[in-house]
């Protein structure tokens, strides 16, 4: 089988405030079963943004119907942005257990938010 | 107007170092990623390889992957490709081509907006 | 790799389609040749963009993982080849198709 690819194609995105963000990720192998996660930033203090398998997230929804089992298109649009989105989003997959297990991200899309226009 | 001028083409001996560079201009250079494409004569195009708005990351085609090495300087708006080791199947015309966006250098091709008008590489003993 | 038809053909002001598959979701562009070494000319980009000087009879469409290039109203000046290009899974590196010769009649 394929070695899985978390594919983020987006280096940067700009939106102006109030606005929405489409953030793209898509992966090349249902392998291995578990969730997608989104979050912004890394390490110990980043804050998570989507669980395909929690909820809701009021300001999220997601590009494709990630409830299918074929699906490989987990990007998502986040609602009504402010400065405070501003950040670096990460995709991850996670490997089903108990608890889930990171297993491996993409390699981030900065989004900068533009002052609203006047 | 967006223009970017490709030189060091010419004929080049197998084994050594082929070098071209691209001058850009008519855009805030360090904005945009970069790529170079070739086209071998009577075949189709090729992705050669591509670099990201801030040189953080490239990316290169099969063919010349451990070969190539892609380069910015943002100073100056220029890339610059070198192949080591030339060969034969290397000769034709390359192109230089700049991204809509900023990166990732990978995923640029389908994401290019504007062409040089080529510079032609025959490498020959 | 990119899988695009070798050729096509049509007569002027009939509608032309090429699809591109096999480069994942995003992203798509295509890419004219009117003669071999000639530089290529962008006439869509990221899936459905086209840059302001391209006619608006170009335009382009993604499903899935396919992407549809169309020309409405095909004008004898559009014989050429079109390329399409995006990001091969396989190598992790961008690719193009073989590209695909159009024919006006």
């Known amino acids: 089988e394929e070695e899985l690819q978390i594919i983020q194609p987006d280096k940067s995105v700009s939106v102006a405030a109030g606005e929405s963000a489409i953030l793209h990720c898509t992966i090349t192998s249902l392998f291995p079963v578990g969730p997608i996660q989104w979050f912004r930033g890394a390490g110990p203090a980043r804050v998570l943004i989507y669980n395909q398998r929690q909820g809701p997230f009021p300001r999220v929804t997601t590009v494709s119907e990630t409830t299918k089992r074929e699906n490989m298109d987990f990007s998502i649009s986040i609602s009504n942005i402010t400065p405070a989105d501003a950040g670096t989003y990460y995709c991850i997959k996670f490997r089903k257990g108990s608890p889930d297990t990171e297993f491996k991200s993409g390699a981030g899309t900065e989004l900068s938010v533009r002052a609203k226009p006047s | 107007a967006v223009t970017l001028d490709e030189s060091g083409g010419g004929l080049q001996t197998p084994g050594g170092a082929l070098s071209l560079v691209c001058k850009a201009s008519g855009f805030t250079f360090s904005s945009y990623a970069m790529g170079w494409v070739r086209q071998a004569p009577g075949k189709g195009l090729e992705w050669v390889a591509g670099i990201d708005d801030d040189g953080s990351t490239a990316n290169y085609g099969p063919a010349v992957k451990g070969r190539a090495t892609i380069s910015r300087d943002n100073g100056q708006s220029t890339v610059r490709l070198q192949l080591n080791n030339p060969r034969a199947e290397d000769s034709g015309t390359y192109f230089c081509?700049?991204?809509?966006?900023?990166?990732?250098?990978?995923?640029?091709?389908?994401?290019?907006?504007?062409w040089g008008h080529g510079t032609e590489v025959i490498v020959s003993s | 790799a990119l899988t695009q038809p070798a050729s096509v053909s049509a007569n002027p002001g009939e509608t032309v389609k090429i699809t591109c598959s096999g480069g994942g979701i995003y992203y798509y562009g295509w890419y004219q040749q009117k003669s071999p070494g000639s530089a290529p000319v962008t006439l869509i980009?990221?899936?459905?963009k086209r840059p302001s000087d391209i006619p608006s009879r170009f335009s382009g469409s993604t499903s899935g993982s396919t992407n549809t290039f169309t020309i409405t109203g095909v004008q004898a000046e559009d014989e050429a080849v079109y390329y399409c290009?995006?990001?091969?899974?396989?190598?992790?590196?961008?690719?193009f198709g073989a590209g695909t010769t159009l024919t006006v009649l």
């Open positions: 980009y990221e899936n459905d």
């Open positions: 081509a700049k991204a809509s966006v900023t990166g990732w250098s990978a995923h640029i091709s389908g994401r290019l907006d504007t």
């Open positions: 290009g995006g990001y091969d899974s396989n190598t992790t590196s961008g690719i």
